[in-house]
């Protein structure tokens, strides 16, 4: 058989943030190429990244069709220059990925504070509603559109002059917090899906502080 020099892929790993989803694997190919297939539990296999020498394959276009489905991928190994060759069982070597359910497992990307506005002793903080690659009716959905109320944001805020942090939570992308007049505050937000078992929280957003350009102040 012509497959004696091919090795099966291993360490198949899903890397996914805000539904941008890439399958990675090892090893770096030596005299071999790879093709990836993806399927839902009940669906047909679809081939992607044909005869590639890469060790990753972007599967975003497939998983965004239904982010609540569970997907399985497999990576086939072929001898370079002889991709028709099969193994002793009559098919090329392949390795299965772990199952992957995007809605439950995609990492939440680092959020961004879009703006904050002070009116007297209240500050309205708005979190940017990041666009995903999930589509509905030919438009790209935002993170909020996809997750709905499953997604909350936690706001951490503190006086610039001290380190004691306070928190607030919201099911929208807005906060309205009480502040002391004449004090400057700093803010950071985190995206959270409390109902998840894994990947429940994003990293914290960059810190934004009052007195810098992003904010706005009104008496």
């Amino acid at each position: 058989s012509g497959t004696t020099n091919t090795v099966a892929a291993y360490n198949l790993t899903w890397k996914s943030t805000n539904f941008k989803t890439i399958l990675e694997w090892e090893p770096k190919p030596v005299n071999q190429v790879y093709t990836v297939q993806i399927s839902t539990k009940s669906g047909d296999w679809k081939s992607k990244c044909f005869y590639t020498t890469d060790t990753e394959c972007d599967l975003t276009d497939e998983i965004v069709k239904d982010v609540k489905q569970t997907y399985l991928a497999r990576v086939f190994s072929y001898p370079a220059g002889n991709v028709e060759s099969t193994g002793s069982a009559g098919e090329p070597l392949y390795e299965n990925s772990p199952e992957f359910t995007p809605y439950l497992e995609t990492n939440l990307g680092q959020p961004t504070i879009q703006s904050f506005e002070q009116v007297g002793t209240k500050v309205n903080v708005t979190v940017e509603d990041e666009r995903t690659l999930v589509r509905r009716n030919n438009t790209f959905l935002s993170l909020r559109d996809v997750f709905g109320k499953d997604l909350i944001y936690t706001l951490y805020y503190w006086k610039s002059s001290s380190s004691g942090k306070k928190t607030a939570k919201t099911h929208t992308n807005e906060f309205l917090i009480d502040v002391d007049k004449g004090e400057n505050y700093c803010f950071s937000v985190q995206a959270v899906i409390p109902s998840r078992k894994v990947n429940r929280k994003s990293t914290d957003s960059p810190v934004e502080c009052m007195g810098q350009e992003k904010g706005e102040f009104r008496e």
Epitope: R136, G148, A168, T172, I177
Partner: antibody, heavy 125, light 108 residues
């Protein structure tokens, strides 16, 4: 002033699919609220069935999930409930409701603040 | 699921009296997600209290809510004739959202 109106057949045969529509008037279904279905069995308490966002994002009661589909039609300002394989135990008053954000404790949380009048559905042959 | 148990099942009182309704959760509920509804015969429920203690717009101040964790209370300080109805507590923090079994406040 947002108003909700349920519509659909009042009588459904066992094993068939119950289909109800809720029409939203006085406001847009795409304006950042969620839209829910709740039912009340005769002389009993309230049971949450599920909810939908204008984007199509849904949450369902796990006890009904295998039989329930909630969908939204933004062009008609309507959302709908389908409950399959019904039995006499699905006889109830079905309400649609708006789940709107209210300010509380520095953030915004959702509560069912506007309800339809309810429609009685009887499952019987 | 979170089970909400309301007590008493029925409360028989006269107009002008104080009504105290209890709602106990099977596990801790973030007060941000606790609401109270009023339902009269043949009508849909009406939101009275959200966030355990905040009155909905237009709700008279004789209605007040309190509590945290697993124990919540709705108090009607002086019952008016229009207050005789069934009251439900609800949690909207954990799917499935659940309602208590209701407390009927009836005229003695």
């Amino acid at each position: 002033q947002v108003q909700l109106q349920e519509s659909g057949p009042g009588l459904v045969k066992p094993s068939q699919t119950l289909s109800l529509t809720c029409t939203v008037s006085g406001g847009s279904i795409s304006s950042g609220q969620y839209w829910s279905w709740i039912r009340q069995h005769p002389g009993k308490g309230l049971e949450w069935i599920g909810e939908i966002y204008y984007s199509g994002s849904t949450r369902y009661n796990p006890s009904l999930k295998s039989r329930v589909t909630i969908s939204v039609d933004t062009s008609k300002n309507q959302f709908s409930l389908k409950l399959s394989s019904v039995t006499a135990a699905d006889t109830a008053v079905y309400y649609c409701a708006r789940d709107a954000p209210y300010y509380y404790g520095g953030g915004y949380y959702y509560y069912m603040d506007v309800w339809g009048k309810g429609t009685t559905v009887t499952v019987s042959s | 699921e979170i089970v909400l148990t309301q007590s008493p099942g029925t409360l028989s009182l006269s107009p002008g009296e104080r009504a105290t309704l209890s709602c106990r959760a099977s596990e801790s509920v973030d007060s941000s997600y606790l609401a109270w509804y009023q339902q009269k015969p043949g009508q849909a429920p009406r939101l009275l209290i959200y966030g355990a203690s905040t009155r909905q717009t237009g709700i008279p101040d004789r209605f007040s809510g309190s509590g945290s964790g697993t124990d919540f209370t709705l108090t009607i300080s002086r019952l008016e004739p229009e207050d005789f109805a069934v009251y439900y507590c609800q949690q909207a923090g954990v799917v499935p959202y659940t309602f208590g079994g209701g407390t009927k406040v009836e005229i003695k």
